[in-house]
Amino acid sequence: PSGLVTANITDSEALARWQPAIATVDSYVISYTGEKVPEITRTVSGNTVEYALTDLEPATEYTLRIFAEKGPQKSSTITAKFTTDLDSPRDLTATEVQSETALLTWRPPRASVTGYLLVYESVDGTVKEVIVGPDTTSYSLADLSPSTHYTAKIQALNGPLRSNMIQTIFTTIGLLYPFPKDCSQAMLNGDTTSGLYTIYLNGDKAEALEVFCDMTSDGGGWIVFLRRKNGRENFYQNWKAYAAGFGDRREEFWLGLDNLNKITAQGQYELRVDLRDHGETAFAVYDKFSVGDAKTRYKLKVEGYSGTAGDSMAYHNGRSFSTFDKDTDSAITNCALSYKGAFWYRNCHRVNLMGRYGDNNHSQGVNWFHWKGHEHSIQFAEMKLRPSNFRNLEGRRKRA
């Protein structure tokens, strides 16, 4: 045979290939040996032109020999040398992960090494490299950023040889929720002041939404989605405006039906309504609250009342949203047009929190029927939502 070469070399395998002898032969005898490795001999068919070498030692130079046999005759031997790759370290793991530190541990490769290259990278693209000694099987990472996803990689070194890299992914603690999907998660991160926060719908960094979080009412963690307080904002708006949202989150505003749909699609939410009028207060809580998508015309689900304001939302349960330019209520007349607002009207309302501020004419104002009736426009109203299991989450955080 002639032209003996090796290909597809890894840390434990290689493929030997050769040009066949010109004459027909019965078999080829292959042998290979390396430093501190006993010689292995294999006989293969005379039709064969390649042979897979397996169970090789890593980072080892091998000598490969082959000759042909035909009956009692043997050809001359041809030789080739090759070196197996350095094998990778194994079981790279991040343990003892804190807000700014983590411990990386690994098992060494079978081959002897001269050191290791460690690379760790955060999601924002910050990359750090460190070389550690050959006898090291752990390394403490420091100066990490809290609530950050990291990818750590390790590669074994032996002179000029480098193994394949292996990796592990971990997230530093500090914030329980790096991308809070609602105000409850922002609160569980340690934010306890009411105000503007950025939440991330479905925890997706690309789906950022600025919201006002009420961190004080009944334990806090509420996304406020409606506020009436002074009549400065116009709430007699069209379908498009109610879908998108409008107003100043610090003042009077409506968060938007599309946002409500996306938020309530994240899990089971509860609704809280806070009402204030001339020093009197009342509230209503519904333990199941959701808003459907645009195809359902933002259909309302509201169930499980408790509170002091009276169960006025029950009348609106199961209704689609209505505005003056998209009439989805069950009345012959257009409820939004009649009452100069927008809501999940039926025929027409028990609740009209988006009605005309300060208008005490029957059913025209900011009404919550079972508290102040239809002939009194309430001075202050907020609608807000948070996960129904917030109490459990809060307790878990306190125990932690």
């Epitope: 169960d311 029950a314 009348y315 609106h316 349960n317 199961g318 069950s330 009345a331 012959i332 007349t333 039926r346 025929n347 027409c348 309302h349 028990r350 029957h362 059913s363 239809h374």
Partner: antibody, heavy 120, light 107 residues
Framework: QVQLVESGGGLVQPGRSLRLSCAAS????????MHWVRQAPGKGLEWVSG????????YYADSVKGRFTISRDNAKNSLYLQMNSLRAEDTALYYC?????????????WGQGTMVTVSS | DIQMTQSPSSLSASVGDRVTITCRAS??????LNWYQQKPGKAPKLLIY???NLETGVPSRFSGSGSGTDFTLTISSLQPEDFATYYC?????????FGQGTKVDIK
């Protein structure tokens, strides 16, 4: 199918008590408000009392307030009306009625009624 | 309490006639009005809820309209089975109150 069956009516002397029952079937009982509506012989309909699905809220007509008590046992799918200090003017056919989804102030299913006669 | 006044108290009509019954509330009730039909010896049956919505299974010859204080029940073409007493009821506030009824009989 959805059904309401009243029982417990009868002839009773003024000042005495009577307890009406209503057995419900064919729907998720505790999801709905329930009511009692009465009809005096040859007269129109008069709402008497209502109770929320959970039983947490009860409502009464002024004419029966303090004398009648509405209650429900959701485990037994049953509605009750305890009538005390009965008067002649309480004589009527008493209907049990199911409220609709929402507030439950619209009565979409009615029983056949049970007759209460108050007479000495 | 809100008073409900129906008119007429009774009417005579023939099969095929268009019949209109009105109901007036003593105060504004938006569209919180229901209509019921009652035949002799039978329990009332819900026909129309929220002033204009036809209850499932009720024939389309029945219709309701109105808002605020004035409401109407219309039977477009009276059928033999429609001879009965009709009641309006406000579900706007407790106590829910009924009209005195309108008896529709055969002319």
């Amino acid at each position: 199918q959805v059904q309401l069956v009243e029982s417990g009516g009868g002839l009773v002397q003024p000042g005495r008590s009577l307890r009406l029952s209503c057995a419900a079937s064919g729907f998720t009982f505790d999801d709905y408000a329930m009511h009692w509506v009465r009809q005096a012989p040859g007269k129109g309909l008069e709402w008497v009392s209502g109770i929320s699905g959970s039983g947490g809220s009860t409502y009464y007509a002024d004419s029966v307030k303090g004398r009648f008590t509405i209650s429900r046992d959701n485990a037994k799918n049953s509605l009750y009306l305890q009538m005390n200090s009965l008067r002649a003017e309480d004589t009527a056919l008493y209907y049990c009625a199911k409220g609709t989804v929402g507030e439950g102030d619209t009565f979409d299913i009615w029983g056949q009624g049970t007759m209460v006669t108050v007479s000495s | 309490d809100i008073q409900m006044t129906q008119s007429p108290s009774s009417l005579s009509a023939s099969v095929g006639d268009r019949v209109t019954i009105t109901c007036r509330a003593s105060q504004y009730i938006q569209g919180f009005l229901n209509w019921y039909q009652q035949k002799p010896g039978k329990a009332p049956k819900l026909l129309i809820y929220d002033a204009s919505n036809l209850e499932t299974g009720v024939p389309s010859r029945f219709s309701g309209s109105g808002s605020g204080t004035d409401f109407t029940l219309t039977i477009s073409s009276l059928q033999p089975e429609d001879f009965a007493t009709y009641y309006c009821q406000q579900s706007y506030s407790t106590p829910q109150t009924f009209g005195q009824g309108t008896k529709v009989d055969i002319k």
